[in-house]
Interface confidence: low
């Protein structure tokens, strides 16, 4: 019989229901915005905005200060008071729409939904390791703001993204706001603008450059700004918007907008469609060619990548990559395929595609009928003409006008659909050692920390845990403070270590010590932990073998049994070759001699399953007693593997030594030609791994084996005679004297 060890699913080596408690802060209301600050003298802070209030927290998430930002018109509003005596507009709650750091001062800038979307500047005051906010400055000059031209009207109640860039000594605010007809009519925020913060912090300089959705499209064409960031020479905005000005406005897609970070100009404003797809390795019948589109960006983050992912993306280590989580539509519910997919867009490649698109539009010969695009911002035109003009005049340049690049940038899901039903609502990517890790928040309030690799058919989890018991969605914006990430869910802010919350979710020593170095996991006798959790027994260099099963569960007291042991951490080397003298198996008092591994039996084990087998020959000692006993495997002096060495003992109960007893044989005669069906009855006849019925020394072919009965077909006899009949179990004869008589056929 060829018994094989049962597979253990890879998921059995971890438990994502393990509870982790991470530091948290209850903000007293739904968290609307969050930003962190780290000074160069060890001082740091977390700023958390909720409706009508701004909290200042220390690095330990303890409250340091709290500031009333609304309601507007309320005498208790501390920020409103900075604008002098009112009225300043209709009273109402202040929902924070913008919370950014101006690195030049440094200062915190907050902008809300009230008071025409104006902003407030709060100078930072380090106090030891904490930071306080100085009295706010109102970034609004009544004399130069009008409903139709308002440089100080920054935030839209429908949402605004801001990135601050230093150019020389000046701070430029790159602002992108969602508009509709009502918002546009009220102190006219712009869709995209670049505003310079005045040196005296009295507001933003007038005469700023801007693009806005044209009035005729405001009702039907809405742009959601999902993310903004600055890297290299550019500022980027990510949008979700209708694919066409003229077609169905519910058919959405994702675009990247690029603006110069070195010149406060919008002439080189460029847009590029980002196309993210799920392309399963085995395409279903009827599935679209090139994969299923996931056109709607939910969250995004850009980060430099580690060596392994860089290689897979064919870029250099440390290069900046834009990561986006995409869904099939606004509601996020797909037909088939995963709920969320993650695509990676190397920034250098984005820039190259944009530059090539400019060449196609502006360098002759220009393809006839190639449109400049962005018809929601500007008059329609064909390349190379400027917007609204039939031809290029000598003193204008094709390149100095906004452009939609004619080709899209297409990528496939890095996770190959493995996020499955998970709905990702937050994303932050970090590089740890050579590893690129995606820290994701989910719709049901969990954090997934997963290595970003594309070549696998399973997810490499750093962690997967629940932030709390509320199960509320994790919000889009994530901030970093030192070695921690700050996630918001409901009214709480949670501080999650970048290295993961702990190691207790790794259930086996092997899985524990194979964890990434940065996690600091070690084995503590019977659990995986960080050193502070179990300083006495914590170690990172060896794992004991682990026996999970063996076969058979019984063997004869006399005679040998071929014992197969199942488990993990037997070898560490894929070949499963065992150096001499490293593995010692005992069953009760009896040794079990290791057998060389049969290479013909080696079969590839999928990485999602794992099992190791070890075979040995059990020859009970004369002193061994009948009855139940333990199987023990001890491994010593094994050469180290890549992550650890195997060292230690594993014991498993449940083996029994038995004495087979033969009670009856029938019939006791049969034809010389053979073929008589012999029935041998007794006890413990099926123990061990080998048995043979011998008729005159020749094997009687076994047809059935059970604990109390053996059936076999007699071999042909040489002559008519009475011949000895014996039963051997494990090569040893079962006591008893039996004969079988061959008769004439």
């Amino acid at each position: 019989e060829d018994w094989q060890c049962p597979r253990t699913p890879y998921a059995a080596s971890r438990d994502f229901d393990v509870k982790y408690v991470v530091p948290s802060f209850s903000a007293g209301g739904l968290v609307q915005a969050m930003v962190t600050y780290e000074g160069d003298r060890n001082e740091s802070a977390v700023f958390v905005a909720i409706r009508n209030r701004l909290h200042v927290l220390g690095p330990d998430l303890k409250s340091v200060q709290s500031l009333a930002t609304g309601p507007a018109g309320d005498p208790g509003c501390q920020t409103c008071a900075a604008c002098g005596p009112g009225p300043h507009g209709p009273p109402g709650d202040t929902d924070t729409k913008v919370l950014v750091l101006d690195p030049a001062l440094p200062a915190l800038v907050s902008c809300g939904s009230s008071l025409q979307g104006r902003c407030f500047l709060h100078d930072l005051e380090p106090q030891g390791t904490a930071v306080h906010l100085a009295a706010p400055a109102c970034l609004f000059s009544a004399h130069h703001n009008r409903p139709d031209d308002c440089p100080d009207c920054v935030a839209s109640p429908l949402g605004t993204r801001v990135t601050v860039v230093e150019q020389g000594q000046a701070s430029y605010f790159y602002v992108a706001s969602s508009l509709d007809a009502a918002v546009a009519a009220s102190f006219s925020p712009r869709s995209v603008s670049i505003r310079r913060l005045k040196a005296d912090a009295s507001g933003f300089a007038p005469g700023f450059v801007a693009l806005s959705v044209l009035p005729k499209h405001l009702v039907s064409y809405s742009i959601e700004y999902v993310h903004s960031f600055h890297t290299g020479a550019f500022v980027y905005f990510l949008t979700v918007q209708p694919a066409s000005v003229t077609d169905d406005p519910s058919a959405l897609h994702t675009r990247l907008a690029r603006l110069s970070a070195t010149e406060p100009e919008l002439g080189d404003y460029r847009e590029l469609v980002l196309d993210c797809r799920f392309a399963p390795k085995r395409r279903r019948r009827g599935a679209p060619e090139g994969g299923q589109p996931y056109p709607v960006l939910r969250v995004a983050h850009s980060a430099p990548v580690g060596a392994q992912l860089a290689t897979e993306l064919s870029i250099a280590e440390g290069q900046e990559v834009l990561f986006g989580v995409f869904v099939t539509g606004k509601d996020g519910g797909p037909g088939v395929g995963p709920n969320s997919v993650v695509c990676a867009f190397p920034i250098d490649l984005l820039d190259t595609l944009i530059d090539e698109g400019v060449e196609r539009c502006c360098e002759s010969p220009v393809h006839p009928g190639l449109r400049r695009g962005l018809d929601f911002f500007q008059s329609p035109s064909f390349c190379p003409n400027p917007p609204g003009l039939e031809a290029l005049s000598p003193n204008t340049s094709c390149r100095h006008f906004p452009l939609l690049v004619s080709s899209s940038f297409s990528r496939v899901d890095l996770f190959n659909g493995l996020l499955g039903p998970v709905q990702v609502t937050a994303l932050y990517v970090t590089r740890l050692d050579n590893v690129t890790v995606a820290h994701m928040g989910t719709m049901d309030g969990r954090i997934l920390q997963v290595e970003l690799v594309r070549s696998l058919n399973y997810l490499l989890y750093v962690s997967n845990f629940s932030l709390g018991d509320s199960g509320q969605p994790v919000q889009r914006d994530v901030s970093r403070l030192g070695d921690h990430l700050l996630f918001a869910s409901g009214d709480q802010v949670f501080q999650v270590p970048i290295q993961g919350p702990g190691c207790r979710h790794f259930l086996t020593c092997g899985r524990c010590l194979r964890a990434w170095h940065f996690m600091g996991c070690g084995w503590c006798g019977n659990m995986c932990g960080q050193q502070k959790e179990c300083p006495g027994s914590w170690q990172q260099d060896h794992c004991p073998p682990k026996l999970t099963e063996f076969h058979p569960h019984s063997g004869p007291l006399r005679g040998s049994t071929r014992l197969t042991l199942c488990g993990s951490n037997f070898y560490l080397h894929p070949s499963g070759l065992v150096p001499e003298g490293t593995h010692q198996v005992t069953v009760g008092q009896s040794p079990c001699r290791p057998l060389p591994k049969d290479s013909s039996k080696l079969r590839p084990v999928p990485r999602k399953d794992f099992v190791e087998e070890f075979e040995c020959e059990l020859e009970p000692l004369g002193t061994q007693a009948v009855g139940p006993t333990n199987v023990s495997l001890t491994v010593t002096n094994m050469p180290p593997g890549k992550h650890f060495r195997v060292d230690g003992t594993s014991v498993l109960r449940g083996f029994s030594f038995m004495e087979p007893v033969l009670i009856a044989v029938q019939p006791l005669f049969g034809p010389r030609a053979g073929g008589t069906c012999l029935t041998l009855e007794g006890q413990s006849l099926s123990v061990g791994t080998s048995r043979a019925v011998l008729v005159n020394g020749t094997e009687c072919l076994l047809a059935r084996v059970s604990e109390g009965q053996l059936l076999c077909a007699t071999p042909p006899g040489a002559t008519v005679a009475s011949v000895p009949l014996s039963l051997q179990v494990g090569g040893a004869q079962v006591p008893g004297s039996w004969t079988f008589q061959y008769r004439e056929d």
């Epitope: 940065f518 990172q540 080397h573 070949s575």
Partner: antibody, heavy 120, light 107 residues
């Protein structure tokens, strides 16, 4: 920037003992293991042993078992190797080299080496 | 102990040439081999780990291959700054051991 700074050159008499140091900077000291490697003049490299900078656990090359004692001072992020009962055979350059566990047993950063001369 | 045999002891090359260093282990060590460069009066520097895994900051002209007992380090276009001693090291078994080295010199 990762740095391993070793103490200066030493001239010692036969029979004496000496302690050489390797001060680490630019990385999380206790997450690593420190190797010590000997290089006699014009010869190859010989692994002496290593010490876990977190718990002080050591592993030695049997050849150097009574010759080298490895210790660590976490408070100063410094690893030490004491060489005992020195003979002319111990004249060599001694290197410390960081070992990153997850990357396996490759030595990714090395000290500048300390030249030890044993002579009467 | 595992013995690592490097050959040749000395390699003479001209700039721009492709060069290969050999390292043979006395027993099967999988891919647990690492390559180091040591310039005159300098410390060893890690070039390749686990037979073929590249190291951040090391020029792409350096590559490694092999498994089992035979390993190769290659430089696809030698530059003058590559003149140095090259050592292989195994991490399959205690004690960790190094090869005797190959000296790369200019013709």
């Amino acid at each position: 920037e990762v740095q391993l700074q070793q103490s200066g050159p030493e001239l010692v008499k036969p029979g004496a003992s000496m302690k050489i140091s390797c001060r680490a900077a630019g990385f999380s000291f206790t997450g690593y293991t420190m190797n010590w490697v000997k290089q006699s003049h014009g010869k190859s490299l010989e692994w002496i042993g290593l010490i876990n900078l977190n718990n002080g656990g050591t592993s030695h090359n049997q050849k150097f078992k009574g010759k080298a004692t490895l210790t660590v001072d976490k408070s100063s992020s410094t690893a030490y190797m004491e060489l005992l009962s020195l003979t002319s055979e111990d004249s060599a350059v001694y290197y410390c080299a960081r070992w990153l566990r997850r990357g396996g047993y490759a030595m990714d950063y090395w000290g500048q080496g300390i030249s030890v001369t044993v002579s009467s | 102990d595992i013995l690592l045999t490097q050959s040749p002891a000395i390699l003479s090359v001209s700039p721009g040439e492709r060069v290969s260093f050999s390292c043979r282990a006395s027993q099967n060590i999988g891919t647990s081999i690492h390559w180091y460069q040591q310039r005159t009066n300098g410390s060893p520097r890690l070039l390749i780990k686990y037979a073929s895994e590249s190291i951040s900051g090391i020029p792409s002209r350096f590559s490694g291959s092999g498994s089992g007992t035979d390993f190769t380090l290659s430089i696809n276009s030698v530059e003058s700054e590559d003149i140095a001693d090259y050592y292989c090291q195994q991490s399959d078994s205690w004690p960790l051991t190094f090869g005797a080295g190959t000296k790369l010199e200019l013709k």
